[in-house]
């Protein structure tokens, strides 16, 4: 049954030129995770498939690294990286769970990490 919840890193900020880890965690379900898709708006960044492993979209290969775990590391951040990121968990038998992270890339060094929060 779709009893799961996704916990994400929430609203986060990072410095231009730096890196950031996007993390989601699915809990409260016994469903099998078959694949996690990481997307920015409508662009697919990366896939972590339980059988086939990681695939990074060619256009992001230079700046995206898999992990840690099912998370995603964004490197060499630019102001254009500001925006919404989604972790989409494909599971069986539950179906799809989606988590949202908002990343703000700042020019200065005042970037602070936001609090963790839950998405049902």
């Amino acid at each position: 049954m779709m009893t799961g919840t996704i916990e994400t890193t929430g609203n986060i900020s990072a410095e231009k030129g730096g890196s950031i880890i996007l993390q989601c965690h699915l809990s409260s379900t016994t469903a099998q995770v078959t694949q996690v898709n990481w997307e920015q708006q409508d662009q697919l960044l990366a896939i972590c498939n339980a059988d086939l492993g990681w695939h990074i979209s060619p256009s992001f290969k230079d700046r995206v690294a898999p992990g840690p775990g099912l998370g995603l590391t964004l490197q060499s951040l630019t102001v254009n990286d500001t925006g919404e990121y989604f972790c989409i968990y494909h599971t069986y038998p539950d179906g799809t769970y989606t988590g949202r992270i908002f990343l703000e890339v700042l020019e200065s060094s005042v970037a602070e990490h936001g609090a963790r929060f839950q998405i049902p």
Partner: antibody
Framework: QLQLQESGPGLVKPSETLSLTCTVS??????????WGWIRQPPGKGLEWIGS???????WYNPSLKSRVTISVDTSKNQFSLKLSSVTAADTAVYYC???????????????WGQGTLVTVSS | DIQMTQSPSTLSASVGDRVTITCRAS??????LAWYQQKPGKAPKLLIY???SLESGVPSRFSGSGSGTEFTLTISSLQPDDFATYYC?????????FGGGTKVEIK
């Protein structure tokens, strides 16, 4: 328009292996949001879920048939297949392949079905 | 396994009638219930999902309700095209299981 088409022998002898293939057209079997399943229906009876598969090969089977069932996928041919071993007359049924679609918040649903193929187990 | 029990097994009705079919689950499945329509020699067609959500393209005379263990499918005004067999299916817990079917026939 997505279409699913079952193919395979219509007659199988007792104790042999039933083999069916489902060919998917009008869409990719390798989509992350879809799972692909087999359901059967004995003549004049209800529906029974046999099992399902993900494009990358993960499988889930009905425990009542698990010891005899193998479902596989061939993404290069946009096909998935069913093998049911040691068949008896009780396995005579119309076999359907179907797509299980995942939508956020709604679970997985059999939204597209093949037209079904009758398999008779008889000597 | 979760047992799905439908009633009645056969229902005789006339065009224009309001028809109600019941489905009971042997344990709670929350709202993870679907309804399918099947005509002779054809594959089942999805009508309702998540107990009460109407599948795209399905006429609004079909509606679903219920949660937990008791569910109903209602056809507000039976049309000639609606004479068929209807199945409920739980999709909350593996293995997926279906009800035994309700045949809606012409009175």
């Amino acid at each position: 328009q997505l279409q699913l088409q079952e193919s395979g022998p219509g007659l199988v002898k007792p104790s042999e292996t039933l083999s069916l293939t489902c060919t998917v057209s009008g869409g990719s079997i390798a989509s992350s949001v879809y799972y692909w399943g087999w359901i059967r229906q004995p003549p004049g009876k209800g529906l029974e879920w046999i099992g399902s598969i993900y494009y990358s090969g993960s499988t889930w089977y009905n425990p009542s048939l698990k010891s005899r069932v193998t479902i596989s996928v061939d993404t290069s041919k946009n096909q998935f297949s069913l093998k049911l071993s040691s068949v008896t007359a009780a396995d005579t049924a119309v076999y359907y392949c179907a797509r299980e679609a995942g939508r956020t918040g709604t679970g997985l649903l059999f939204d597209y079905w093949g037209q079904g193929t009758l398999v008779t187990v008889s000597s | 396994d979760i047992q799905m029990t439908q009633s009645p097994s056969t229902l005789s009705a006339s065009v224009g009638d309001r028809v109600t079919i019941t489905c009971r689950a042997s344990q709670s499945i929350s709202s993870w219930l679907a309804w399918y329509q099947q005509k002779p020699g054809k594959a089942p067609k999805l009508l309702i999902y998540k107990a009460s959500s109407l599948e795209s393209g399905v006429p609004s005379r079909f509606s679903g309700s219920g949660s937990g263990t008791e569910f109903t499918l209602t056809i507000s005004s039976l049309q000639p095209d609606d004479f068929a067999t209807y199945y409920c299916q739980q999709y909350g817990i593996l293995p997926r299981t279906f009800g035994g079917g309700t045949k809606v026939e012409i009175k």
